[in-house]
């Protein structure tokens, strides 16, 4: 059957009907409903929200909605023994203590169960010692400290500013440098945009505001105690000592009022350059230790958090496909929040809710999608993408055989300037075509397409007249689907102007001040950006689930493969002598990319010309498209990262949030000049080139004519 036979309405009518049904007012109402109390993972509040969503999705018309639970390792502060940091004098007396909680915003003073700021999965401990300021605690910051400035962090407590990279990478770097503890703080340079007031008068971070967050280095493992397998009742669990990705030193986050008190006394070396200085009225000395008058004072951390196996709950809704019920298009976003979740995640969850309602409305009118759509409300994303990963582990065999695409739906907004899309190259054309059909919500672009405003505000660095689409990294629930299982994935949200707003995330990220009012007053009063994001996410799901031929263009993969091969070759060519000495050649990789390009081109011609009314041929061609992403998976995974299996993309080893291309080769080349055994190091580069070459060639062959 064709799509129109299955649904009794033409596909175009369906898409229009679906988009027209999405309403900004509903998203606003849902957001308000989801943000009145905290929904921390592992709490009754979040379980009740799961049951509410289950009930409402059933009312909206989904065929089935189930709760799936897993028992995973979570981390919480000790309720009777709070975490804090002190400055202690030579007698050991605490002469300054950091705050125990964030002052709650107006109207929320009587709300219980606001978890105080903490770094999830920090071990317990009370280290004391001299402080070293390590800038953003990036790899390059520690290189600067250790190699250029000859400053040793061993035995020291380091203080790092949030921003630029995932906090777990900061902690890993500090551990490797020998630090005994880590203090994370939000510097106004990164979390206070000039000319904007602090919350509640604006969207900036007040001095008492603190960013919560996990500090794991899971590398895609999911629950730290059950890597590779679902954390169900009969799962074998590792001991805590063998758990994946846990930090080994105490970590705690603070706001800039408290940071001021620690940093103002810093002595030792001056900061190396202006890139190390934030906006506080402090010298930004690196240390170690405090300046002259205060040199006998030390810093002491008091961390008493505990990690415990806790039950979490996903909500999984199904809208069965009429023609290909065994092909799954998944729309998923998380439900758990650190506190109120005004942006993260509920601005996304509210959009998912409205998308479900719209699909349900069509279904009640007799329509069904061609393929099955699965909707997911994930739990425990904030604790390491746990809900999505455990569900994918439990359903991996189904997903790798049936998974067409995964669309992520965390925060719908991180600004209100323009669209931001990260996706597989297979989806580029889908996104371009869809955004050309949608109306821009931007001021000054009335009557213009979203594509036009997006292209103007965020142009592609390579192709004029086209918008930027970024690589997928991690730090969100698409990770297991894309990086581990090789299911084509994408995400879209509204973002800030990266040219003028250089701070790292939105200022109130993961703080108590991330409320409904923040969104309604400052980011999107008309909820027009939320509506646009709903149209983009929902439109992508609609097309992926309902197009007769999957809306994937393999030629776009060919283009990026060439670009990535050029890029990694240029990195390697910074060492021409070694390449010559160790006979390192990229010829095979460029040859495989050329083959891929040619085969993709021929496949696209066949795709254009084949008889779409032949169901066997149609299914065959669609399967080749669906399985192309899967073909980039190496079952052995990347070195020391077995759950990152995609050969073309992986989260950067230096910043989980960022995507890296040809990550195996990239990591083999990284800092290669400092390796003690160059022969072995360049041998590993050659091994990684061969893996990449094989993978690209093998992927190309999946697109060849079958017989």
């Amino acid at each position: 059957k064709s799509s129109s036979e299955a649904t009794n309405i033409t596909p175009k009518h369906n898409m229009k009907a679906f988009l027209d049904e999405l309403k900004a007012e509903n998203i606003k109402k849902f957001l308000h409903n989801f943000t009145q109390i905290p929904h921390l993972a592992g709490t009754e509040q979040n379980f009740q929200l799961a049951k509410q969503i289950q009930s409402q999705w059933k009312e909206f018309g989904l065929d089935s909605v189930e709760l799936t639970h897993y028992d995973v390792l979570l981390s919480y502060p000790n309720k009777t023994h709070p975490n804090y940091i002190s400055i202690i004098n030579e007698d050991g007396n605490e002469i300054f203590n950091t705050s125990l909680f964030e002052p709650p915003p107006a109207g929320y003073e009587n709300v219980s169960d606001i978890v105080p700021p903490f770094s999830a999965f920090s071990p317990q401990g009370m280290p004391e010692g001299d402080l070293v300021y390590v800038n953003y605690a990036r790899t390059e910051d520690f290189f600067k400290l250790e190699r250029d400035m000859k400053i040793n962090c061993s035995g020291k407590i380091v203080i790092a500013r949030y921003g630029k990279v995932f906090r777990g990478n900061k902690v890993k770097n500090a551990q490797l440098a020998g630090a005994t503890g880590v203090i994370l703080y939000s510097d106004p340079a990164d979390y206070f945009a000039p000319g904007v007031k602090s919350y509640p008068d604006g969207w900036n971070l007040p001095g008492g505001g603190v960013q919560r967050g996990n500090i794991l280095n899971l590398n895609g493992a999911g629950d730290p105690l059950t890597p590779g397998y679902p954390a169900n009742e009969y799962a074998y669990r590792r001991g805590i000592a063998e758990a994946v990705g846990l930090p080994s030193i105490p970590v705690h986050p603070i706001g800039y009022y408290d940071a001021q008190k620690l940093l103002e006394k810093m002595g030792g070396s001056a900061s190396p350059d202006s890139s190390w200085r934030g906006s506080l009225k402090v010298p930004y000395n690196v240390g170690p230790g405090f300046t002259g008058n205060f040199s006998t004072q030390k810093v002491k951390m008091h961390i008493h958090s505990t990690s415990e196996v806790t039950r979490i709950y996903n909500v999984i809704g199904t809208l069965r496909g009429a023609v290909e019920p065994d092909r799954y298009v998944i729309l998923g976003g998380h439900r758990d929040s650190w506190v109120f979740g005004g942006i993260d995640p509920q601005s996304g969850a509210a959009v998912v809710h409205e998308i479900v309602r719209s699909f349900g409305t069509l279904k009640k009118e007799g329509w069904r999608p061609r393929r099955t759509i699965l909707f997911a409300s994930w739990d425990a994303e904030e604790f390491g993408l746990l809900g999505s990963t455990e569900w994918a582990e439990e359903n991996s065999r189904l997903l790798q055989e049936r998974g067409v695409a995964y669309i992520n739906a965390d925060s719908s907004i991180e600004g209100n300037y323009t669209l931001r899309v990260d996706c597989t190259p297979l989806m580029y054309s889908l996104v371009y075509n869809l955004t050309k059909e949608l109306e821009s919500p931007d001021e000054g672009f009335e009557g213009k397409s979203l594509y036009e405003s997006w292209t103007k505000k965020s142009p592609s660095p390579e192709f004029s007249g086209m918008p930027r689409i970024s690589k997928l990294g991690s730090g969100n629930d698409f990770e297991v689907f894309f990086q581990r299982l090789g299911i084509a994935s994408g995400r879209a949200r509204y973002t800030k102007n990266w040219e003028t707003n250089k701070f790292s995330s939105y200022p109130l990220y993961h703080s108590v001040y991330e409320t409904y009012e923040l969104v309604e007053k400052f980011y999107d009063p008309m909820f027009k950006y939320h509506l646009t994001v709903a149209q983009v996410r929902g439109g992508m799901v609609f097309e992926l689930a309902n197009s007769v031929v999957l809306p994937f263009d393999c030629r776009d993969y060919a283009v990026v493969l060439r670009k990535y091969a050029d890029k990694i070759y240029n990195i390697s060519m910074k060492h021409p002598q070694e390449m010559k000495t160790y006979s390192v050649s990229f010829d095979s990789l460029f040859s495989a990319v050329k083959n891929f390009t040619e085969i993709a081109s021929k496949f696209s011609e066949r795709l254009r010309d084949f008889d779409k009314s032949n169901p066997i041929l149609l299914r065959m061609m669609n399967d080749q498209l669906m399985f192309l992403e899967r073909a980039f998976i190496d079952p052995l995974g990347l070195p020391d990262r077995p759950f990152y299996r995609h050969v073309i993309y992986a989260p950067s080893s230096h910043n989980k949030y960022a995507g890296e291309s040809f990550p195996g080769i990239y990591d083999a080349l990284f800092d290669i000049e400092s390796k003690v055994d160059p022969s072995q190091a360049w041998g590993e580069v050659k091994r990684q080139i061969s893996i990449a070459t094989f993978t690209v060639q093998a992927a190309a062959e999946t697109l060849s004519e079958v017989a």
Epitope: P38, T43, N110, R311
Partner: antibody, heavy 121, light 107 residues
């Protein structure tokens, strides 16, 4: 529907022990804990302690530590409270109540019908 | 331990009347307070959780509120089945403690 069915009334001698049961149905037993509450005739309510069957963790009101022992059997979805070294002060109605197993919860939502314990020589 | 002082200990009121029962907490308990109803046969039912959230199936004439350390259960229009015992429960910190109870009697 959620139900907590408690065992029948107990008559015991001073110094003896009794073991009360609370059989749960209508929900996933391991997603919740069971709290126990004491009510003496014409008196108010006192929290004794709680057990979380999934984890096996128990938490007691210090006042009842040594007096009450809480256990649970996941296979039969039942919770138990043993009261030992009984005195007349232990004569009361004892309630079990369901409590969510999580870092934050809303305390006791569903209650058993109560078990009367009479200690008399 | 946190003391919960409930008042009044008994209250006579008429059908259709609006009544309020109060519990005062000796320490900060945030919104971690429930209201329970006990029937003459001993059956206990939760009416309100987290200070002001109504349990499912509980009539909307029941409501909960807070003012500082005082927590109130209000019945907007008394019906015959409401003339029973009521208790507050704080669950902010262990050991969890109950108010002394209010016996609501028909005038």
């Amino acid at each position: 529907q959620v139900q907590l069915q408690q065992s029948g009334a107990e008559l015991a001698r001073p110094g003896a022990s009794v073991k009360l049961s609370c059989k749960a149905s209508g929900y996933t037993f391991t997603s919740y804990g069971i709290s126990w509450v004491k009510q003496r005739t014409g008196q108010g309510l006192e929290w004794i302690g709680e057990i979380f069957p999934r984890r096996g963790n128990t938490y007691y009101n210090e006042k009842f530590r040594g007096k009450a022992t809480l256990t649970a059997d996941k296979s039969s979805s039942a919770a138990y409270m043993e009261l030992r070294s009984l005195t007349s002060e232990d004569s009361a109605v004892y309630f079990c109540a369901r409590v969510f197993d999580g870092y934050y919860n809303y305390a006791m939502d569903y209650w058993g019908q109560g078990t009367s314990v009479t200690v008399s020589s | 331990d946190i003391q919960m002082t409930q008042s009044p200990s008994s209250l006579s009121a008429s059908l259709g009347e609006r009544v309020s029962l109060t519990c005062r907490a000796s320490q900060d308990i945030g919104s971690s307070l429930n209201w329970l109803q006990q029937q003459p046969d001993g059956t206990i039912k939760r009416l309100i959780y987290a200070t002001s959230s109504l349990d499912s199936g509980v009539p909307t004439r029941f409501s909960g509120s807070r003012s500082g350390s005082d927590y109130s259960l209000t019945i907007s229009s008394l019906e015959s089945e409401d003339f029973v015992d009521y208790y507050c429960l704080q669950y902010a910190s262990s050991p969890y403690t109950f108010g002394g109870g209010t016996k609501l009697e028909i005038k």
